[in-house]
Interface confidence: low
């Protein structure tokens, strides 16, 4: 079952996916489309990586991340309600059935009506290095010392707008559990 | 290892098309994407676009965005640049480009006259 | 569209070192925009040089090196050859396009 996650229309939807390079800059394919992933490749690819490089996106998907060290997590950008469903990030490791697959669920909801818009928080910046992915060794050094390792089994993506005075309500609203 | 050959010069007066066309030969094509990347007499590089065969699916630099088409042609491993309403300014050498930017077509002058 | 921006020109004298950089109208250039470095010399075709800010590609000397350097992408040449003289350019990717720098010639002195 998808874990889901939410953001508001007009939001940047903050997707994360995350593998382990054996090495910086040894990097493996990773294909991002929407629809749950098949059993080969990603449907409807929105963002592909090679070995190198980004080398194929559409309009409003691109990573924010260091995905030299293996961020590939997704950020769409000014999220519509039709952004709403399924998202698979595949981390295409060599070998046969090898490819690590993550079906994660958005749900956008309508932009609330505040008198002043709010600040939004690039995750990246403010949290670096929290997520670490299944079977691809440990985690790096934690960098916020108060939140345990996040394992990306439990976790698959968080809201885009993690502010420090709502981080544990906006885990506990994504579904996310902290070990 | 995959090499890029591109079309022949071209001269052509303003506000007509032209096509360019880009041969991959020793590599997978579909899966690579194909790049297009101008440059001017004098002037600079200028990324205009690409393409993944294999999706069909282009992508266009804002400047150049309802004026240039890109396809690809998986049956010939053949990827195509589309520009039209030709100015003066867009006389310039047109590369294509695959493999992250790394492997580079021979480039093709386009001269825009009338 | 976005602004990428580097030194028109640099001069250096043969076995020095020198730094490129490569700053985007948007603010800081990070690792995210995958900065790739280009060389050009007259009347051929760019050569692919470095890749996703600090990767060398099998073919290049290990005196190019790249970087990210007061929120600008970097390339520092050490020991220069008289070879190096081209012109370099960066390439950055704004999620859903790529863009140029406007080069920067170097000349090597000698």
């Known amino acids: 079952s998808e874990v889901e996650y939410r953001a508001e229309v007009g939001q940047n939807a903050y997707l994360p996916c995350f593998y382990t390079p054996a090495a910086p800059g040894n990097l493996v394919p990773v294909c991002w489309g929407k629809g749950a992933c098949p059993v080969f490749e990603c449907g409807n690819v929105v963002l592909r990586t090679d070995e190198r490089d980004v080398n194929y996106w559409t309009s409003r998907y691109w990573l924010n991340g260091d995905f030299r060290k293996g961020d590939v997590s997704l950020t769409i950008e000014n999220v519509t309600l039709a952004d709403s469903g399924i998202y698979c990030c595949r981390i295409q490791i060599p070998g046969i059935m090898n490819d690590e697959k993550f079906n994660l669920k958005l749900v956008i909801k309508p932009a609330k009506v505040t008198p002043a818009p709010t600040r939004q928080r690039d995750f990246t910046a403010a949290f670096p290095r929290m997520l670490t992915t299944r079977g691809h060794g440990p985690a790096e050094t934690q960098t916020l010392g108060s939140l345990p390792d996040i394992n990306l089994t439990q976790i698959s993506t968080l809201a885009n707008e993690l502010r420090d005075s709502r981080l544990a309500n906006d885990l506990r609203d994504s579904g996310a559990t902290i070990r | 290892q995959v090499q890029l050959v591109q079309s022949g010069a071209e001269v052509k007066k303003p506000g007509s098309s032209v096509k360019v066309s880009c041969k991959a030969s020793?590599?997978?094509?579909?899966?690579?994407?194909i790049y297009w990347v101008r440059q001017a007499p004098g002037q600079g590089l200028e990324w205009m676009g690409s393409i993944i065969p294999i999706l069909g699916t282009a992508n266009y630099a804002q400047k150049f965005q309802g004026r240039v088409t890109i396809t690809a042609d998986e049956s010939t491993s053949t990827a195509y640049m589309e520009l039209s309403s030709l100015r003066s300014e867009d006389t310039a050498v047109y590369y294509c480009?695959?493999?992250?930017?790394?492997?580079w077509g021979q480039g093709t002058l386009v001269t825009v006259s009338s | 569209q976005a602004v990428v921006t580097q030194e028109p020109s640099l001069t250096v004298s043969p076995g020095g070192t020198v730094t490129l950089t490569c700053a985007s109208s948007t603010g800081a250039v990070t690792s995210g925009y995958t900065p790739n470095w280009f060389q050009q010399r007259p009347g051929q075709a760019p050569r692919a040089l470095i890749y996703?800010?600090?990767n060398r590609h099998s073919w290049t000397p290990a005196r190019f090196s790249g970087s990210l350097l007061g929120g600008k992408a970097a390339l520092t040449l050490s020991g220069v050859q008289p070879e190096d003289e081209a012109d370099y350019y960066c390439l950055l990717y704004y999620g859903g396009a790529w863009v140029f720098g406007g080069g920067t010639k170097l000349t090597v002195l000698g």
């Open positions: 020793g590599g997978t094509f579909s899966s690579y994407t």
């Open positions: 480009a695959s493999a992250s930017h790394t492997i």
């Open positions: 996703t800010t600090n």
